[in-house]
């Protein structure tokens, strides 16, 4: 059961896992949610009746029954983790805490003009978890305007005290606002020889990378695969750090893989959930329950629905035993990872999907697809925008996609003959073009950034960014879509949709209602055969029914090719060029967004 409200003057008795310090009960709830075992918490607010050393303590708790006895206590605030809830969860905390000093290791001290500048500095520093800033009213002259960047082992303060004329806050890396480099590649046959801050068991390097991503101290990792020569280290995921923030030494070693935390990846904080199944693999851990299940998928569902379950192993049924049902072992551990991973026993293992909601806005679950039909419904494609030109008269020019609160990604060829951003209007949250009246609110365009290698759509580099004059407030009908990650280059997307108001057939008129079509991706090799006079480069991606009938069309240019992967929508392509409209057998050609992620980051993060 999901309980979101906080219980004032209430303390949960027992079940303590650990104590951390948080500046508010609200943030204590977030910390509890992200902790692998915490289901309940008790936070102590500042109060004259409480011992000041207990102020801001956040006691994380667990209970087999998912609840604990309640005791009345002044200044205590208790509540439940959001693990039990289905709604979107974010670790992003933009709050600034006035007159609070959050203690940690002060590793960097510098002058800053404002708390905001100090927070930005923290967000763009690889080690920084939180900061304290002494305002210009701070009594001590030499400490005024000093920005202290801090880190701790847990990512939360070691203590919080009251201190006049200072403000504190957290890094906004988890808000996807960091300008730090995002290295998504995993390096095979590589060991990073730096200090280990922790180690866990993981079935593959991708899971290891995701664990590193949400471990507060992990900057990079090394994973020893199941073929690693030293048996005791197989499937070991070493979480690492260094003073410089980068690996100091890379050692070539077969059967090891290394990579970086993706915490700084501003465009799309990776999905926390590990959705893959691991065949012939057993996860060991504390047993929560053993239940009968028809399949490993059913077992994963059971684990996801059991709030304390972190991972599972499914043993398929032997012949006709137990009505063809296998055994589903629901498991947990202190850190959310298996205590040991065994191979060759015939089990199928995996993780709960409960953590999938712990991601940034672009991964938000949106309205379910409407099966069949070509007209969309409101909120189905909340990242889709309609770009209008007002010259010579106002009309739909191109589609586009929201990728950030001030950024639209579209096609470069849309701006042929557009001499100024002043004539452009971006409308978001629109389903029908007829909704757009003179008084309909829109976003003005501050800047058009066209890829400098763009010449014509068919030659590639057909990509452009629009910087909006004002920021987009995310709602159910207007929110961003995730950019694909380089690590997902080999993903085979099977649930891809093209959307737009463009012509549905040659010489048709712009559609009033946003149109959608589910279309399969086509290999570049097959696509090249269809376009013998055009080079289909790796920077392009093709999609379209082999028998035609569904494809993007003129007017949909710049709009998204959106693909769902691991329950998250990714902007895989930008509608670019192609033969006619749904010309049978001729796929549409799209800008392959994954190849431009670095360019997008460079442009959107430029000061």
């Amino acid at each position: 059961e999901c309980v979101t409200q906080l219980l004032k003057d209430t303390c949960f008795e027992g079940g303590d896992i650990t104590t951390v310090f948080t500046p508010s009960a609200k943030y204590c709830q977030v910390v509890c949610t992200y902790h692998p075992r915490c289901l309940l918490f008790t936070f102590t607010a500042e109060s004259p009746s409480e011992d000041p050393t207990r102020w801001f303590t956040c006691v994380l708790k667990d209970s087999v029954t998912e609840t604990l006895p309640r005791v009345n206590r002044t200044a205590a605030i208790s509540g439940y983790s959001f693990k039990q809830c289905s709604h979107q969860i974010s670790a992003c905390n933009k709050d600034i805490y006035v007159d609070l000093d959050m203690k940690g290791i002060n590793y960097n001290s510098s002058v800053a003009k404002s708390a905001q500048e100090c927070q930005e500095r923290c967000t763009d520093d690889v080690h920084c978890h939180f900061f304290t800033y002494a305002t210009r009213q701070f009594p001590s002259l030499e400490h005024r305007n000093i920005c202290l960047l801090k880190h701790t082992q847990t990512g939360t303060p070691t203590r919080i005290t009251k201190l006049d004329k200072v403000v504190s806050g957290f890094s906004l890396k988890s808000c996807a606002l960091s300008n730090l480099a995002c290295i998504r590649d995993i390096f095979p046959n590589t060991v990073f020889a730096d200090s280990n801050i922790d180690s866990v068991m993981a079935p593959d390097a991708f899971v290891c990378g995701r664990i590193c991503t949400h471990h507060p101290g992990c900057l990079f990792f090394t994973f020893f695969s199941q073929e690693w020569p030293k048996e005791s280290q197989r499937n070991l995921c070493l979480l690492k750090t260094s003073e410089s923030g980068l690996p100091s030494t890379r050692i070539k070693k077969s059967k090891a893989l290394s990579g970086f935390s993706l915490q700084s990846c501003r465009h799309s904080i990776p999905v926390f959930c590990h959705s893959s199944f691991y065949h012939d693999t057993d996860f060991l851990g504390e047993e929560l329950d053993i239940v009968a299940a028809k399949s490993h998928e059913a077992c994963q569902k059971l684990c996801t629905n059991a709030v304390r379950c972190q991972f599972f192993t499914y043993t398929p049924a032997q012949a006709s035993c137990n009505e063809g049902k296998g055994k589903c072992y629901l498991k947990l551990s202190s850190n959310g990872s298996p205590t040991k991973i065994l191979h060759g026993r015939g089990g199928i293992s995996g993780y709960t999907l409960r953590l999938c909601k712990m991601d940034n806005e672009c991964t938000t679950k949106i309205k379910p697809r409407i099966v069949g039909g070509t007209a969309s419904v409101r909120g189905e494609w909340p990242w889709q925008v309609t770009l209008h030109t007002t010259s010579p008269t106002q009309r739909h020019l191109c589609g586009g996609s929201i990728i950030g609160n001030q950024w639209i990604l579209t096609a470069a060829h849309c701006f042929y003959g557009v001499e100024s951003p002043k004539i452009l209007r971006v409308y978001s949250g629109i389903l029908n073009q007829s909704e757009i009246k003179e008084d309909t609110s829109f976003f003005g365009v501050q800047e058009i950034i066209i890829h400098d290698q763009y010449k014509m759509a068919e030659s590639g580099y057909d990509i452009a960014l629009l910087k909006l004059e004002t920021t987009v407030n995310y709602t159910d009908s207007q929110r961003p879509i995730c950019l694909p990650s380089k690590g997902d280059r080999n993903v085979i997307y099977t649930d891809c949709w093209v959307t737009g108001w463009g012509y549905r057939k040659l010489r048709d008129k712009i559609q009033n209602t946003l149109q959608k079509a589910k279309i399969p991706l086509v290999t570049n090799e097959e696509c090249q055969k269809r376009y013998r006079g055009h080079k289909i480069t790796h920077k392009m991606i093709c999609a379209g029914y082999r028998e035609g009938g569904k494809d993007a069309c003129k007017g949909d240019s710049g709009g998204p090719l959106s693909c769902k992967h691991n329950e998250v929508w990714h902007l895989v392509g930008i509608t670019s060029w192609g033969e006619g409209c749904a010309q049978r057998e001729r796929p549409g050609v799209y800008t392959n967004v994954v190849e431009y992620v670095d360019w997008i980051l460079e442009k959107t993060q430029a000061v």
């Epitope: 055969k529 269809r530 006079g533 080079k535 033969e579």
Partner: antibody
């Protein structure tokens, strides 16, 4: 009106090269593909390759890949097909043709053909 | 490469006859099939594209049909100027390939 005018007949020795030109007029040269097709005496049609004059991109039939070079000069709206290491079996009529569609498709306009004879 | 097999290779018919030439592709080529007419010493001329679309200026007695792998060119009433060689061509996959041709002769 659309026209493709090819260069005149050629007689070549085995091992040498031939370069056939195809001058286009009556349409936007860079907007359509130019294909090259050959026809040996009494035989059918065989596609050799294509050029996209707008981008300069070429695509060749594997059977000719190492011997054929197709180029285009946008300033004169002329496409060229050069075939090297000629052998007697290259004796044929060589045609340039324009595709009906911007991205490929049927060939709607053809040059008059250039007869190339390879003989020692 | 996709093979296009035309039949018959030779066809004798009289003015006014209805004739049918067939073309079989070695794999599905959807609607990407064209038909050409070629007269001795001349370049081929496009008659039909996308299976059944008559090219500009082509008389209505020429029609195309078929789907997938089997295609047909029909001349409903032969005229003296129709005696020539006819080729089918697939444009579905590079390289484009032609049938070996059907020579239509006067009976």
């Amino acid at each position: 009106q659309v026209q493709l005018v090819q260069s005149g007949a050629e007689v070549k020795k085995p091992g040498s090269s031939v370069k056939v030109s195809c001058k286009a007029s009556g349409y936007a040269f860079s907007n359509y593909l130019i294909e090259w097709v050959r026809q040996a005496p009494g035989q059918g049609l065989e596609w050799m390759g294509v050029i996209n004059p707008g981008s300069g991109y070429t695509n060749y039939n594997e059977n000719f890949k190492d011997r054929v070079t197709i180029t285009a000069d946008e300033s004169t709206s002329t496409a060229y097909m050069e075939l090297s290491s000629l052998r007697s079996e290259d004796t044929a009529v060589y045609y340039c043709a324009r595709t009906y569609g911007k991205y490929g498709g049927a060939m709607d306009f053809w040059g008059q053909g250039t007869t190339v004879t390879v003989s020692s | 490469d996709i093979q296009m097999t035309q039949s018959p290779s030779f066809l004798s018919a009289s003015v006014g006859d209805r004739v049918t030439i067939t073309c079989k592709a070695s794999q599905s080529v959807s609607n990407d099939v064209a038909w050409y007419q070629q007269k001795p010493g001349k370049a081929p001329k496009l008659l039909i594209y996308y299976i059944s679309n008559r090219y500009t200026g082509v008389p209505s007695r020429f029609s195309g049909s078929g789907s997938g792998t089997d295609f047909t060119l029909t001349i409903s009433s032969l005229q003296p100027e129709d005696f020539a060689t006819y080729y089918c061509q697939q444009d579905y996959s590079s390289p484009p390939t032609f049938g070996q041709g059907t020579k239509l002769e006067i009976k």
